[in-house]
Interface confidence: medium
């Protein structure tokens, strides 16, 4: 007759792990005992448990209430058992040695080998700010058994390094994104990508990337000279900028206050009827926590009734 | 030959406690699984707990959380720690032993102790 059994077992951490041992044997013989030992390089034999055709099912006291024998229906020729809830100690060589009429004693061996699936961290680095270098975005954590990898998913574009650390029972792997902040990565997703042998699908944390700036100010509202006449109504100017975070604005006159009647909302200032006490230098000041950009520009109100006598003077003139 | 000759057994009050020896005449190391039968008056012998020598115990569900067996090959001694005795449990307790056969056969050659006396009564 022969053994039959695995080379390596595999199982993930907390499951229950299955030792075959099946004795093929020729017609007539019959197994009287299996006995299960841990046999780890450099250290004696450790009984795990033996299964006795008289007896019964022995366990040793260090595995009592893991060790069992495969629900019914059983081979007499089947010395498999199982090892509940596996844990990373667990991780080793193992033997099964079976005694048979008439043919004697028969071993194999077998290498228990138990996943320790990651749970992975990410850590994003310091705040993101435009015209900073090359700078790290985020780091992914994650620790296992075997070593896990650790990539990244993203359309952004940046340089990624790794390192392992290795512990007594498994590996933990650190990989770092960097990348050149600029104003365009913002509300871009980066994705941290943990790969296991222990794990039914890839694990993905995602971090979603904000990169401080404050983009230049302009006015608008000034593209025609000719609208800003007195008596006109509705004239306003609108503060355009962007940035992260959305900035405040605030609006000043160079050569004074602003004059009465004058309303302030936000990016936007808003004048009552046109008079000549309107012209004047106008600032708008655009700030965040990062930066702070100025954008002025004059105001000259128009007489339309100084406009009309300078053409009459002219007509006559010609 | 190995003899096995068993000690401590007696009369006890149910809730009680007793520990059974059994001593080999030879080395008990190459025993393969040595253990605990008892037989009440008028009944079959039944299996009480039984040790391999790897220390591993297997034990009759009667007796599961109230006795512990155990051996001390240096010794040449199986023991069996009895707690919270009941009248049930009354009977001859032998000791036995079992060796494979050459080159580990399973012809197991089977030895047997003469029994001890335990009376769980108040």
């Known amino acids: 007759g022969e053994l039959e059994t695995s080379d390596v077992v595999t199982v993930v951490l907390g499951q229950d792990a299955k030792l075959p041992c099946f004795y093929r044997g020729d017609s007539g013989e019959q197994v009287g005992q299996v006995a299960w030992a841990r046999v780890d390089a450099g250290e004696g034999a450790q009984e795990l448990a033996l299964l006795h055709s008289k007896y019964g099912l022995h366990v040793s006291p260090a595995y009592e209430g893991r060790v069992e024998q495969p629900p019914p229906p059983r081979n007499p020729l089947d010395g498999s058992v199982l090892l509940r809830n596996a844990v990373q100690a667990d991780e080793g060589e193992y033997e099964c040695r079976v005694s048979t009429f008439p043919a004697g004693s028969f071993q194999a061996r077998l290498r228990l080998r138990v996943l320790v699936p990651p749970l992975p961290s990410l850590n994003p680095g310091p705040a993101l700010e435009e015209g900073q270098g090359l700078t790290l975005a985020a780091s992914c954590t994650a620790e296992g058994s075997p070593a896990p990898s650790v990539t990244w998913d993203t359309e952004v574009k940046g340089t990624t390094s790794s390192r392992s650390f290795k512990h007594s029972r498994s590996a933990a792997v650190t990989s770092e994104f960097h990348l050149v902040p600029s104003r365009s990565m913002n509300g871009q997703p980066l994705t941290c990508v943990v790969s296991h042998p222990g794990l039914l699908q890839d694990q993905r944390i995602t971090h979603i990337l904000h990169v401080s700036f404050l983009a230049e100010a302009s006015v608008r509202g000034l593209e025609d000279q000719n609208l800003w006449h007195i008596g006109r109504e509705g004239a306003m100017l609108k503060c355009l900028s962007e940035g992260q975070p959305p900035p405040s604005y605030n609006w000043t006159r160079l050569d004074g206050p602003l004059p009465s009647g004058v309303r302030v909302d936000g990016d936007t200032l808003g004048f009552p009827p046109l008079t000549t006490e309107h012209s004047g230098i106008y600032v708008c000041h655009v700030s965040n926590e990062f930066s702070s950009r100025d954008s002025q520009v004059t105001v000259d109100v128009l007489d339309p009734q100084e406009d009309s006598g300078k053409q009459v003077d002219l007509v006559s003139a010609s | 030959q190995v003899q096995l000759v068993e000690s401590g057994g007696g009369l006890v009050q149910p809730g009680g406690s007793l520990r059974l020896s059994c001593a080999a005449s030879?080395?008990?190391?190459?025993?393969?699984?040595m253990g605990w039968y008892r037989q009440a008056p008028g009944k079959q012998r039944e299996l009480v707990a039984t040790i391999t020598s790897g220390g591993s115990t297997n034990y009759a569900d009667s007796v599961k959380g109230r006795f512990t067996i155990s051996r001390d090959n240096a010794n040449n001694t199986v023991y069996l720690q009895m707690n919270s005795l009941k009248p049930e449990d009354t009977a001859v307790y032998y000791c036995?032993?079992?060796?494979?056969?050459?080159?580990?056969?399973?012809?197991?050659?089977?030895?047997w102790g003469q029994g001890t006396q335990v009376t769980v009564s108040s």
């Open positions: 036995t032993g079992d060796q494979l056969g050459p080159l580990g056969t399973f012809s197991p050659i089977v030895y």
């Open positions: 030879g080395s008990i190391f190459s025993m393969n699984v």
